[in-house]
Amino acid sequence: IWELKKDVYVVELDWYPDAPGEMVVLTCDTPEEDGITWTLDQSSEVLGSGKTLTIQVKEFGDAGQYTCHKGGEVLSHSLLLLHKKEDGIWSTDILKDQKEPKNKTFLRCEAKNYSGRFTCWWLTTISTDLTFSVKSSRGSSDPQGVTCGAATLSAERVRGDNKEYEYSVECQEDSACPAAEESLPIEVMVDAVHKLKYENYTSSFFIRDIIKPDPPKNLQLKPLKNSRQVEVSWEYPDTWSTPHSYFSLTFCVQVQGKSKREKKDRVFTDKTSATVICRKNASISVRAQDRYYSSSWSEWASVPCS
Amino acid sequence: RNLPVATPDPGMFPCLHHSQNLLRAVSNMLQKARQTLEFYPCTSEEIDHEDITKDKTSTVEACLPLELTKNESCLNSRETSFITNGSCLASRKTSFMMALCLSSIYEDLKMYQVEFKTMNAKLLMDPKRQIFLDQNMLAVIDELMQALNFNSETVPQKSSLEEPDFYKTKIKLCILLHAFRIRAVTIDRVMSYLNAS
């Protein structure tokens, strides 16, 4: 058993049929010695008396808020949560496996630039009685500071019969140099509590590997005389690291109709303009990627050909 | 000695072309190592990230763009002498950088070159003949060093009398390649910045 936060404890259980469970001793936080009784949750049934209560925790029915009283007055609370281990593996029931970029990916993180700010998000089908707490650091043995905000519900989607909830959190490395060469990864730890179930999820990454620029901005078209060709120009996104001559981007320019299966014109360039063939009912799209370290492409910025 | 550098665009900052070739060569070599050594811990997640130049050179700090000198997190050990040497500057009057920057890059390359050559000698003794260093990568390191045109003492190639542990050597190769790729990215950024200055 260990303390998650003040008066909240996590009991780690091997989860299998007829498992013996864990013996837990609760101590009432009071100078009083006599006349103390214990109850669980909203029940008035007295579980025991005395300054300590020893319980055998085997299942979720044994978890919950234990309260010690004296003469009708509440003295203190201890909330017991369960963390299940099945076949030597901690349970991952609360969050959905996003399977990208690989199986068992529960947390996904992205950074728009090299400033040390990043966003992580996760998915769940659970809508109520759910809390998250996020901690982060650079490295684990001698951790350097990363400050994370509160996790918030950022999107709701309907997937078949189920509703899916996306939560996200923003974090900022306390002293980040955009030009630095990372040798220690960022560690992100998410504590998830659903009702009386506790789970924890972790992710480890270098900022350079989670870079995904914002789409290029200010796309403009200029038709070329006596030609079907169009000059398309754009600018670096405002959120990208500066100076741009040091943090350079490369671009993919594509002309395509509504359907992905339609024919297309595609060209790659390091410049902020390109010449392509425009077709009726097609769109010109441009996306960006770090020129020197190939992490993710940005989303497309698009304008209609006409 | 100023060696002429053949680049497609004659007005181009001479080292930019070489640094692009360097990044390409080390990226290709790393990809090849990952594929060939698929049963060894060779991915970014699996290896320890070591920097053989740590405490010996200061490339990131020395080559910091002017715009980032206002960022205190970037200034832990920054020197302030300006560039005065090295053929890559090709008579450009610029106060963005110090001699320290290009000489620091040169020293990085020299250290990696020695490590890679020592390692290659060991890998050539491996009866499995599983992986060797790409000669193109070694040639590209040499070309960029020549273009940088710094004179410095030659570092003797390390020789080891004991029987090489090929498993350890291959893991060390992965660690070196990952670190060198990251440094090659920095070098490319620096050259691109200089080219635009």
Epitope: R261, K263, K264, R266, F268, D270, R279 | -
Partner: antibody
Framework: QVQLVQSGAEVKKPGSSVKVSCKAS????????LHWVRQAPGQGLEWMGW????????EYAPKFQGRVTITADESTSTAYMELSSLRSEDTAVYYC???????????WGQGTLVTVSS | DIVMTQSPLSLPVTPGEPASISCRAS??????LHWYQQKPGQAPRLLIY???QSISGVPSRFSGSGSGTDFTLTISSLQPEDFATYYC?????????FGQGTKVEIK
């Protein structure tokens, strides 16, 4: 299976014209760009131009501008390349090639040898 | 027009050995570079597109690399059926242009 089948070899006199055909099968004809590329005996490849069969849009290499005409007939899934004012240096194998991407070629015809000789 | 220069023009190789063909553009073309193989009396065949992207059905011993002005086609271990002429082609701008070809011959 996508296939491009070209018309047979031709022998032409200098100053005359030649029209080579390229019939496509497999896939929808208008879903692809169609190009013409030629190769003189023992020489390399030379791009001549492209057509979008969907709308008849064309683009020609400056070298051939004014001498080449590329057309397409959607009803028969056939593209044509006509080269006029032939000279001996136009002796070459003429290939049609197509792709959903405009700027490179993933399926080629078998080639048509055009010999220009007096 | 962008001029594509291949080297060497002729490459004698022993079967089973690796081979590398270089292609240089007269100006930067990012990764807008494609490789073709042509055997005598046959049409060219696409091997690699956008510098390094492999084509399904093309053996994995063929790989491409490069960006900007310098590109390489590598055949890791030459098989008897690989002896042919190889062309690079740029698609950065019209007119599309090819290298002059590299003939890979049996040593």
């Amino acid at each position: 299976q996508v296939q491009l089948v070209q018309s047979g070899a031709e022998v032409k006199k200098p100053g005359s014209s030649v029209k080579v055909s390229c019939k496509a099968s497999g896939g929808t004809f208008s879903d692809y760009y169609l190009h013409w590329v030629r190769q003189a005996p023992g020489q390399g490849l030379e791009w001549m131009g492209w057509i979008d069969p969907e709308n008849g849009d064309t683009e020609y290499a400056p070298k051939f501008q004014g001498r080449v005409t590329i057309t397409a007939d959607e009803s028969t899934s056939t593209a044509y390349m006509e080269l006029s004012s032939l000279r001996s240096e136009d002796t070459a194998v003429y290939y049609c090639a197509r792709n959903k991407e405009l700027r490179y070629f993933d399926v080629w015809g078998q080639g048509t040898l055009v010999t220009v000789s007096s | 027009d962008i001029v594509m220069t291949q080297s060497p023009l002729s490459l004698p190789v022993t079967p089973g050995e690796p081979a590398s063909i270089s292609c240089r553009a007269s100006q930067s073309i990012s990764i807008n570079l494609h490789w073709y193989q042509q055997k005598p009396g046959q049409a060219p065949r696409l091997l690699i597109y956008f510098a390094s992207q492999s084509i399904s059905g093309v053996p994995s011993r063929f790989s491409g690399s490069g960006s900007g002005t310098d590109f390489t086609l590598t055949i890791s271990s030459l098989q008897p059926e690989d002896f042919a002429t190889y062309y690079c082609q740029q698609s950065n701008s019209f007119p599309l242009t090819f290298g002059q070809g590299t003939k890979v011959e049996i040593k």
